[in-house]
């Protein structure tokens, strides 16, 4: 278990306990309960109050991070008396030993890399372990392939993202023979951490007066349809003076991705490249390979 739990309670205790794997807070059921509520308070004094489970003697916290330390609290009224109990959930271990600079990104539609740095006060023998839990099924994924630096795990590579949902809980635990290591946890949205590939199948066809650029939307991990994409086209005239402005064109995603622009013959040599983003986030992909059209003597 990754932390010490300290109970602050009156004489007749509710025996409050917290399971960090399931994020479930439970207590001993009291006869003739008329009212019960549970909540947590974090270090910034933010209060999170989940719905009570049907049996009213437990509650599950869905989207919380615990590494800064939290205090759980349970209030129960029965027809005879009232109960109140606090449960301190500190992040035990030496300050500054937890993994830091944690980040993840999804790429190539079905791969993910997470990286972190060793805590500044972590001993030389520290070892970190990454666990991921999805929001739907609460299934735990253990890191299958660690990235190492001098034997210490400082990253993780996943090539099977089937266990992830749209929002996931990431936990980096640490161990050492010398001292207790603090944990780090984070909630990440897959849509915010995905880096798209550039659009594929980019083609340019020209007639005497116009050029038509077509492309296919990139394959993504997220389930996105055509209106969920935004594109940017960089139409560039070759052999122009350095510092000349490129023409950047914004195009909304459509069922048939195309951009038609006037370009009469004879036309100078041009290149076009395209990048893609989620329309809501605009986290741009890298540019596609430049496609050339026109002629040097245009």
């Amino acid at each position: 278990e990754k932390s010490d739990l300290r109970t602050v309670a009156p004489a007749s205790s509710l025996n409050v306990r917290f399971d960090s794997r399931t994020m479930n807070l439970s207590w001993d059921c009291q006869e003739n309960t008329t009212f019960s509520k549970c909540f947590l308070t974090d270090k910034k004094n933010r209060v999170v109050e989940p719905r009570l489970s049907n049996n009213e003697c437990s509650c599950t916290f869905r989207e919380i991070c615990l590494h800064e330390g939290v205090t759980f609290e349970v209030h129960v009224n029965t027809s005879q008396r009232g109960f109140q109990q606090k449960l301190l959930y500190p992040n035990s271990g030496r300050e500054g030993t937890a993994a830091q600079n944690f980040s993840c990104f999804i790429y190539n539609a079905d791969l993910m890399n997470c990286t972190w740095a060793r805590g500044p006060t972590a001993p030389r023998d520290v070892q970190y372990f990454l666990y991921i839990r999805n929001s739907k099924r609460r299934r735990e994924i253990r890191c299958p392939y660690y990235i190492q630096d001098s034997g210490t795990h400082v990253g993780c590579h996943l090539d099977n993202l089937s266990g992830l949902t749209s929002r996931n809980y990431f936990l980096v635990n640490g161990t050492s023979r010398e001292i207790g290591i603090q944990f780090f946890d984070s909630l990440l949205d897959t849509k915010k951490i995905e880096r798209f590939n550039p659009p594929s199948n980019v083609t340019v066809r020209c007639n005497t007066t116009h050029c038509l650029v077509r492309w296919k939307q990139p394959r993504t991990y997220q389930k996105l349809s055509y209106l969920d994409f935004q594109y940017q086209l960089d139409v560039h005239r070759k052999n122009t003076q350095p510092g000349t402005e490129n023409l950047l064109i914004n195009v909304s995603g459509d069922l048939e991705n195309r951009y038609n622009f006037p370009s009469s013959e004879p036309r100078a040599k041009h290149s076009v490249k395209i990048r893609a983003a989620d329309v809501r986030i605009l986290n741009w992909s890298s540019w596609s390979e430049a496609i050339e059209f026109g002629s040097d003597d245009g």
């Epitope: 389930k223 996105l224 349809s225 209106l227 969920d228 069922l255 048939e256 329309v279 809501r280």
Partner: antibody, heavy 120, light 111 residues
Framework: QVQLVQSGAEVKKPGASVKVSCKIS????????IHWVRQTPTKGFEWMGG????????VYAQRFQGRVTMTEDTSIDTAYLTLSSLRSDDTAVYYC?????????????WGKGTMVTVSS | QAVLTQPSSVSGAPGQRVTISCTGS?????????VSWYQQLPGTAPKLLIY???KRPSGVPDRFSASKSGTSASLAITGLQADDEADYYC???????????FGGGTKVTVL
């Protein structure tokens, strides 16, 4: 240009079944998420179901579960809606549509609708 | 009874601005799921006007705009024209129903 061409109007007796088709032209059905929505003067628009990429299967509205079947024949780019045990309050215009955005499910292209009348 | 609540009708003179509200709950608009708006002219299929709360598909004039806040959304039509006379519907996804939900529709009349 993408078009959704629906089958013609139907008149059915209570208890019968109806099958409405939706032929996609200008794009491959296998790349699309087709949903069915019906409209009545009293209840307005009611979503019936369609392909949900998150679940990777066709999902149905709870109120139609057990009575509705949606199928697709990708070889001829045609989607089908079958509604069984018809009642008089199933009298409606039935539309097929393409989901243009999975965020909130925005229905972009629509068929012209198929009028289904249930009457004894 | 529609899951999303809209006024049954609004009206305005040509050139004026009208707004249509759409009120939902914490399981749909407030969840937060994106809101779409549709225009339906008499005897025709609906046409997508707005998606992603405030984005217009190509071909929809910028006289149509929309916004979303909390569990409500609204559609605004500026410079009202005679051919804007139609029924307007809001739509979103609802997690408790695991499906799409619509508003009851608002009839816009140009005086």
């Amino acid at each position: 240009q993408v078009q959704l061409v629906q089958s013609g109007a139907e008149v059915k007796k209570p208890g019968a079944s109806v099958k409405v088709s939706c032929k996609i032209s200008g794009h491959s059905l296998s790349e699309l998420s087709i949903h069915w929505v019906r409209q009545t003067p009293t209840k307005g628009f009611e979503w019936m179901g369609g392909f949900d990429p998150e679940e990777n299967e066709i999902v149905y509205a709870q109120r139609f579960q057990g009575r509705v079947t949606m199928t697709e024949d990708t070889s001829i780019d045609t989607a089908y809606l079958t509604l069984s045990s018809l009642r008089s309050d199933d009298t409606a215009v039935y539309y097929c549509s393409i989901v243009g955005s999975f965020s909130g499910w925005a229905f972009d292209y629509w068929g012209k609708g198929t009028m289904v009348t249930v009457s004894s | 009874q529609a899951v999303l609540t809209q006024p049954s009708s609004v009206s305005g003179a040509p050139g004026q601005r009208v707004t249509i509200s759409c009120t939902g709950s914490g399981s749909n608009i407030g969840a937060p799921y994106d809101v779409s708006w549709y225009q339906q002219l008499p005897g025709t299929a609906p046409k997508l006007l707005i998606y992603h709360n405030n984005k217009r598909p190509s071909g929809v004039p910028d006289r149509f705009s929309a916004s979303k806040s909390g569990t409500s959304a609204s559609l605004a039509i500026t410079g009202l024209q005679a051919d804007d006379e139609a029924d307007y519907y809001c739509q979103s996804y609802d997690s408790s129903l695991s499906g799409s939900v619509f508003g009851g529709g608002t009839k816009v009349t140009v005086l």
